[in-house]
Interface confidence: medium
């Protein structure tokens, strides 16, 4: 039992850290391996995470962690029975992957614009709530060349799109992801897509009948 790619870990900086690694052969992760983790702080308890398979040889472990602070460091030990496969440390504040933004919806707005809205995935009291910026990807479902990327660097989780910048009568999908610049985080996963039909004739003719949005 050997590790091919050592664990790579990220924290959502509120409740969960996720580690992923690759074994040198197909492995039943939950039956053969355990990841033990412990906060490097006197009196902290040792915990054990049971990994799951992401692929035949790829294991992933989701570890509940307390609301993190910048100085927290965790000691990680990957075991196959009594064999120590890998040992390392992990500092959540240096490896932040924000939670995925939620509830992306599309609404018709005044002046022939679409209003895209989503929810900040962090409660107001969390450090990351006010640190997030977003990237919104808008793409034409029938034309792979027709896509736009918008960076939302202001606080509010909203984006206004002029309907005239999109092709009339076409179906568009939007998705959003987040990152935390001050934590030098990676991007979050993309939110589920929301799809709508783009018209820029007078809104009132089309609202009930044509406008719809749903999650894939």
């Amino acid at each position: 039992v050997k590790v091919l790619h050592e664990p790579s870990c990220f924290s959502d900086y509120i409740s969960t850290s996720v580690c992923q690694w690759k074994m040198d052969h197909p492995t039943n992760c939950s039956a053969e391996l355990r990841l033990s983790y412990q906060l490097d702080f006197m009196g902290s308890e040792n915990h054990t995470c049971v990994p799951e398979n992401r692929e035949d040889s790829v294991c992933v472990c989701s570890m509940p962690i307390d609301d993190a602070v910048e100085a927290d460091v965790y000691q990680l030990d990957l075991w196959a029975g009594q064999q120590l496969l890998w040992s390392g440390s992990f500092q959540p504040s240096k490896h932040v992957k924000p939670r995925t933004p939620g509830n992306l919806t599309v609404h018709p707005n005044i002046s022939h614009t679409w209003l895209l809205m989503w929810t900040n995935p962090y409660p107001t009291e969390n450090h990351l709530h006010s640190e997030l910026t977003y990237m919104v990807n808008v793409s034409n479902d029938n034309d792979p060349e027709d896509f736009k990327v918008y960076n939302v660097t202001y606080m509010g989780p909203t984006l206004r799109l002029a309907a005239s910048t999109l092709k009339s009568g076409a179906s568009y999908s939007a998705r959003v992801r987040a990152w935390a610049q001050t934590y030098n985080s990676t991007w979050s996963d993309w939110s589920p897509s929301t799809t709508w039909l783009n018209y820029y004739e007078p809104w009132e003719q089309h609202l009930p009948h044509h406008h719809h949005h749903h999650h894939h």
Epitope: E32, N46, D77, W79, A80, G81, Q82, L84
Partner: antibody, heavy 116, light 107 residues
Framework: QVPLQQSGPELVKPGASVKISCKAS????????MNWVKQRPGKGLEWIGR????????KYNGKFKGKATLTADKSSSTAYMQLSSLTSEDSAVYFC?????????WGQGTLVTVSA | DIVMTQSQKFMSTSVGDRVSITCKAS??????VAWYQQKPGQSPKSLIY???NRHTGVPDRFTGSGSGTDFTLTISNVQSEDLADYFC?????????FGSGTKLEIK
């Protein structure tokens, strides 16, 4: 079904060798370490070493190097321990043990008696 | 080699009591400690792995705790069938080493 079935008791003469076996069942023999443990009458436990049947990798307690040789036969899912140059100090019960988290199991033990 | 010291050779307790068996490592062994129960004339049985995790089928009155150098096996609500020797094992460094054992006697 007993996960680890060890061979029966052995009475051997000083200076001789003995080979005891541990037959595994009910799990992937090749992908779990097999440990061997010594227990003298009324005494504690001593770790002899372990073998990884998948590739034959062995780890020994320095105290037992040259005394114990660990091997494994994947085709029969059997681990073996040979003890050589036996003396009265080697009289003991020897256990094989697989200890992988919730899959922990120990053999019933093999009593080796060294006597002229 | 790492020495695992079980300073209590014998412990006497009564049914229903709570008893704590300790094990001290001569150096930091992280959480790499297992606990075993051996009843007279039987093979050892694995109780606890990685310091604090109960094996499947082990009653929840057995609890492991500790990390680094100090480890404890606690038996709450002791039962007569808990009469046995208890051993700790470190598997952080080769060679793995056992504690000398603690014999639990029931009054």
């Amino acid at each position: 079904q007993v996960p680890l079935q060890q061979s029966g008791p052995e009475l051997v003469k000083p200076g001789a060798s003995v080979k005891i076996s541990c037959k595994a069942s009910g799990y992937a023999f090749s992908s779990s370490w097999m440990n061997w443990v010594k227990q003298r009458p009324g005494k504690g436990l001593e770790w002899i070493g372990r073998i990884y049947p998948g590739d034959g990798d062995t780890k020994y307690n320095g105290k037992f190097k040259g005394k114990a040789t660990l091997t494994a036969d994947k085709s029969s899912s059997t681990a073996y321990m040979q003890l050589s140059s036996l003396t009265s100090e080697d009289s003991a019960v020897y256990f094989c043990a697989r200890d992988d988290y919730d899959e922990a199991s120990w053999g019933q033990g093999t009593l080796v008696t060294v006597s002229a | 080699d790492i020495v695992m010291t079980q300073s209590q050779k014998f412990m006497s307790t009564s049914v229903g009591d709570r008893v704590s068996i300790t094990c001290k490592a001569s150096q930091n062994v992280r959480s790499a400690v297992a606990w075993y129960q051996q009843k007279p004339g039987q093979s050892p049985k694995s109780l606890i792995y990685l310091a604090s995790n109960r094996h499947t089928g082990v009653p929840d009155r057995f609890t492991g705790s500790g990390s680094g150098t100090d480890f404890t096996l606690t038996i709450s609500n002791v039962q007569s069938e808990d009469l046995a020797d208890y051993f700790c094992l470190q598997h952080w460094n080769y060679p793995f080493t056992f504690g000398s054992g603690t014999k639990l006697e029931i009054k």
